[in-house]
Interface confidence: low
C-alpha cells in the first residue's frame, strides 16, 4: 500500500484550482474502512492500481484518500444530506492525480489517471448516516453506491431507502 | 456560511438538568469538530466541551467533568449538551462552536458561532 508517501505529495495548489466550475468548500485526508472495520487499501500492480478491501496487521499503516467536498449546481431532493438544500458531493483521491471513477458498465470501482475538470463518474454524492458512517452514491448513476463486493470495491444498486443502512456500502472515515 | 443555531436554554433550580442542543444548518460530519462554550456576565468565553469530528472522543472543562455531557448526531447535523447538576456558577450564555479540524478547545480556533442561548441556575 503507498497512500501515506503519495498524499504528502499534495501541495495545496494543486487542489485550489475550480472542477468544473466549483472549488472546493473543504478538504479532508482520511482513512477509508468498511462498516466491518475492514482498511481500503491501495496498490499499484503492472503500472495500474488495484484497490482492496483487506484486514491490515496491527502494525501496519492505513491508507489515507483525500476527500474535496463540493456543492452541488443541482438542489437535493433530499434532506440531511445537504449543504443549504445542495447535495454535498466528494471526489476521493488516494494519490497525485488518481481518482476513484465508477464505472457503471461494469459495475465497478476503479482508480484513474486523469487532470481536471474531473469528469462527472469521479463524483460521489454523499450521504450521512448514522454511528459515523457515510455511504458513496455515484453522481452519474442514482441509486448506485460503492460498496464492497469479494473484499473489492464494487458498484451496488440500492432498489429503497430502508436499504441504505445495508452493511455493505456503509464506511467510516478515521483521521488515524 | 455555517448556521448553527442553539437551543435549549432557559431557567433551573440548582442541582436541576437541561440539555442544549445545536443544529447546523449545513452539513458538518467529518468537516467540523464541534464544541461548547460559554461566557458569564464580566466575564471572558471559556470552554465547556467538545466532540472530534471523525470519533466519539470527547474533551471536558475541569469544571464540568462528571456533569455535563456532550454527544452529537451526525445524521441531524446536531450536538447536544446535556447538563446535570448544574450549579449557579453554571449560570452563562452557551455557545455551539465549530472548528474545521479534528480537535477544538480553544476560542481563538472556533471557524463559526451560534448566536447563544441563555442558562439561569437560579433558586
Known amino acids: 500500500a503507498f497512500g501515506i508517501s503519495g498524499v504528502q505529495k499534495y501541495t495545496r495548489a494543486l487542489h485550489d484550482s475550480s472542477i468544473t466550475g466549483i472549488s472546493p468548500i473543504t478538504e479532508y485526508l482520511a482513512s477509508l474502512s468498511t462498516y466491518n472495520d475492514q482498511s481500503i487499501t491501495f496498490a499499484l500492480e503492472d503500472e495500474s492500481y488495484e484497490i482492496y478491501v483487506e484486514d491490515l496487521k496491527k502494525d501496519e499503516k492505513k491508507d489515507k484518500v483525500l476527500l474535496s467536498y463540493y456543492e452541488s449546481q443541482h438542489p437535493s431532493n433530499e434532506s440531511g444530506d445537504g449543504v443549504d438544500g445542495k447535495m454535498l458531493m466528494v471526489t476521493l483521491s488516494p494519490t497525485k492525480d488518481f481518482w476513484l471513477h465508477a464505472n457503471n458498465k461494469e459495475h465497478s470501482v476503479e482508480l484513474h489517471k486523469c487532470e481536471k475538470p474531473l469528469p462527472d463518474q469521479a463524483f460521489f454524492v454523499l450521504h450521512n448516516m448514522h454511528s459515523n458512517c457515510v455511504s458513496f452514491e455515484c453522481k452519474t448513476d442514482p441509486g448506485v453506491f460503492i460498496g464492497v463486493k469479494d473484499n473489492h470495491l464494487a458498484l451496488i444498486k440500492v432498489d429503497s431507502s430502508e436499504n441504505l443502512c445495508t452493511e455493505n456500502i456503509l464506511f467510516k472515515l478515521s483521521e488515524t | 456560511q455555517v448556521q448553527l443555531v442553539e437551543s435549549g436554554g432557559g431557567l433551573v433550580q440548582p442541582g436541576g438538568s437541561l440539555r442544549l442542543s445545536c443544529a447546523a444548518s449545513?452539513?458538518?460530519?467529518?468537516?467540523?469538530?464541534m464544541g461548547w462554550f460559554r461566557q458569564a456576565p464580566g466575564k471572558e468565553r471559556e470552554f465547556v466541551a467538545g466532540i472530534e469530528r471523525t470519533t466519539d472522543t470527547t474533551l471536558y472543562a475541569d469544571s464540568v467533568k462528571g456533569r455535563f455531557t456532550i454527544s452529537r448526531d451526525n445524521a441531524k447535523n446536531t450536538v447536544y449538551l446535556q447538563m446535570y447538576s448544574l450549579k449557579p456558577e453554571d449560570a452563562a450564555v452557551y455557545y455551539c462552536a465549530a472548528r474545521n479540524s479534528r480537535r477544538i478547545g480553544d476560542v481563538n480556533d472556533v471557524d463559526y458561532w451560534g448566536q447563544g442561548t441563555q442558562v439561569t441556575v437560579s433558586s
Open positions: 449545513r452539513f458538518i460530519f467529518p468537516i467540523y469538530a
